[in-house]
Interface confidence: low
């Protein structure tokens, strides 16, 4: 089994590892499927691409019957199977079978924390946000290891790329020193950013 690892939105080339001449195409059936779901078929030279892969999949007949998947999504991850059948003696017989495992990485970048003052009060608001990761993130604010209550945490998913964005607001009293950590957990991974507030200089120091 061949393993291919790519970042989300990148291009993946999955090779069948087999060549068929133009002359043989009329007597050949080629199937690409992913975990028993069809991706692409070519029968007697006629190609059919399934809706989930339309407009983002290229069949490269000249390059080992490879499929090229553009703009990778997290759901593209899985095991792909290429089957080549050839017509011999009144029946199609299997000539070749190959498996390719595709891993799609979608890591959230380190979150950014922006801050602004709420007029006529001692309250300051910080917003932690990051986007472009998978699976669904869970954001928490911590101070001295204690979890804090955010005002509003928004998790959204792009229907095209399947990637998530997350942002969260936290209000704090600017008359005391603070060190807040914005922690984002997704799957078995995590990213974080720290925001420090110093009352003496009335300025903040993001931990970069």
């Amino acid at each position: 089994v061949i393993h291919v690892t790519k970042e989300v939105k990148e291009v993946a080339t999955l090779s069948c590892g087999h060549n068929v001449s133009v002359e043989e195409l009329a007597q050949t059936r080629i199937y690409w499927q992913k975990e028993k779901k069809m991706v692409l078929t070519m029968m007697s030279g006629d190609m059919n691409i399934w809706p989930e892969y339309k407009n983002r999949t290229i069949f490269d007949i000249t390059n080992n019957l490879s499929i090229v998947i553009l703009a990778l999504r997290p759901s593209d991850e899985g095991t792909y199977e290429c089957v080549v059948l050839k017509y011999e003696k009144d029946a199609f017989k299997r000539e070749h079978l190959a498996e390719v495992t595709l891993s799609v990485k979608a890591d959230f970048p380190t979150p950014s924390i922006s801050d602004f003052e709420i007029p006529t009060s001692n309250i300051r608001r910080i917003i932690c946000s990051t986007s472009g990761g998978f699976p669904e993130p869970h954001l928490s604010w911590l101070e001295n290891g204690e979890e804090l209550n955010a005002i509003n945490t928004t998790v959204s998913q792009d229907p095209e790329t399947e990637l998530y964005a997350v942002s969260s607001k936290l209000d704090f009293n600017m008359t005391t020193n603070h060190s807040f950590m914005c922690l984002i957990k997704y799957g078995h991974l995590r990213v974080n950013q720290t925001f420090n507030w110093n009352t003496t200089k009335q300025e903040h120091f993001p931990d970069n």
């Epitope: 986007s131 669904e136 509003n152 959204s156 229907p159 095209e160 998530y164 964005a165």
Partner: antibody
């Protein structure tokens, strides 16, 4: 073609709980959609109450109603629900269930609209 | 909170052009959507993403945007166009729709 049908109690007394059901036909409740509740009063116009995401359990509520509102769904029955407790006469309105494609979310969301609406029904809160 | 401002009413003669405006502080960066609502009926989406028209909506309805003001234009107004019209944007910070106050179009 997706259609929404809705029902629930039409007359409530103050402090009671408003409950509404919306049935989705002609399509699945799962998918990249926000299933939404909106209400309309002559004074306040169209007011978004909240929504639930078709592909998960994510909900979002109008901050002014958040403490009183719950939106849920039953995927197996292709239905979603609104519960609004401790109603007052200010909750008298026409209530609509609706569907909106999930907005395009890159860094933050933009672009969402409401493409399918239920017929709406009047809920009156009166003692 | 995000606010959208519409004129309360617009009057127009049959066959003329009706223009309804919708203004918001940051509308230039948001897609604006428009709904038509006739008495005792649910709203209908007539324009989405500033200027796109859903299938089944007559070509007489069009949308445009200049700066922070979006405009719904109804060419060759008919008696059946008499209705309330609402603009809407998506409040990106709070992840929910925000509606304008509505404009009543009266066909004289």
């Amino acid at each position: 073609q997706v259609k929404l049908q809705q029902w629930g109690e039409g007359l409530l007394q103050p402090s009671e709980t408003l409950s509404r059901t919306c049935v989705v036909s002609g399509g699945s409740i799962s998918g990249y959609y926000y299933w939404t509740w909106i209400r309309q009063t002559p004074g306040r116009g169209l007011e978004w109450i909240g929504h639930i995401y078709g592909n998960g359990a994510t909900t979002n509520y109008n901050p002014s109603l958040k403490s009183r509102v719950t939106i849920s769904k039953d995927t197996s029955k292709n239905q979603f629900f609104l519960n609004l407790n401790s109603v007052t006469d200010a909750d008298t309105a026409v209530y609509y269930c609706a569907r909106g494609p999930r907005p395009d979310c890159t860094t933050i969301c933009y672009g969402g609209w409401v493409d399918v609406w239920g017929p709406g029904d009047l809920v009156t809160v009166s003692s | 909170a995000y606010e959208l401002t519409q004129p309360p009413s617009v009057s127009v003669s049959p066959g003329q052009t009706a223009r309804i405006t919708c203004g918001g502080d940051n509308s230039r960066n948001e897609y604006v959507h428009w709904y038509q609502q006739k008495p005792a009926r649910a709203p209908i989406l007539v324009i989405y993403d500033d200027s796109d028209r859903p299938s089944g909506i007559p070509e007489r309805f069009s949308g445009s945007k200049s700066g922070n003001t979006a405009t719904l234009t109804i060419n060759g107004v008919e008696a059946g166009d008499e209705a309330d019209y609402y603009c809407q944007v998506w409040d990106r910070a709070s992840d929910h729709p925000v509606f304008g106050g509505g404009t009543r179009v009266t066909v004289l």
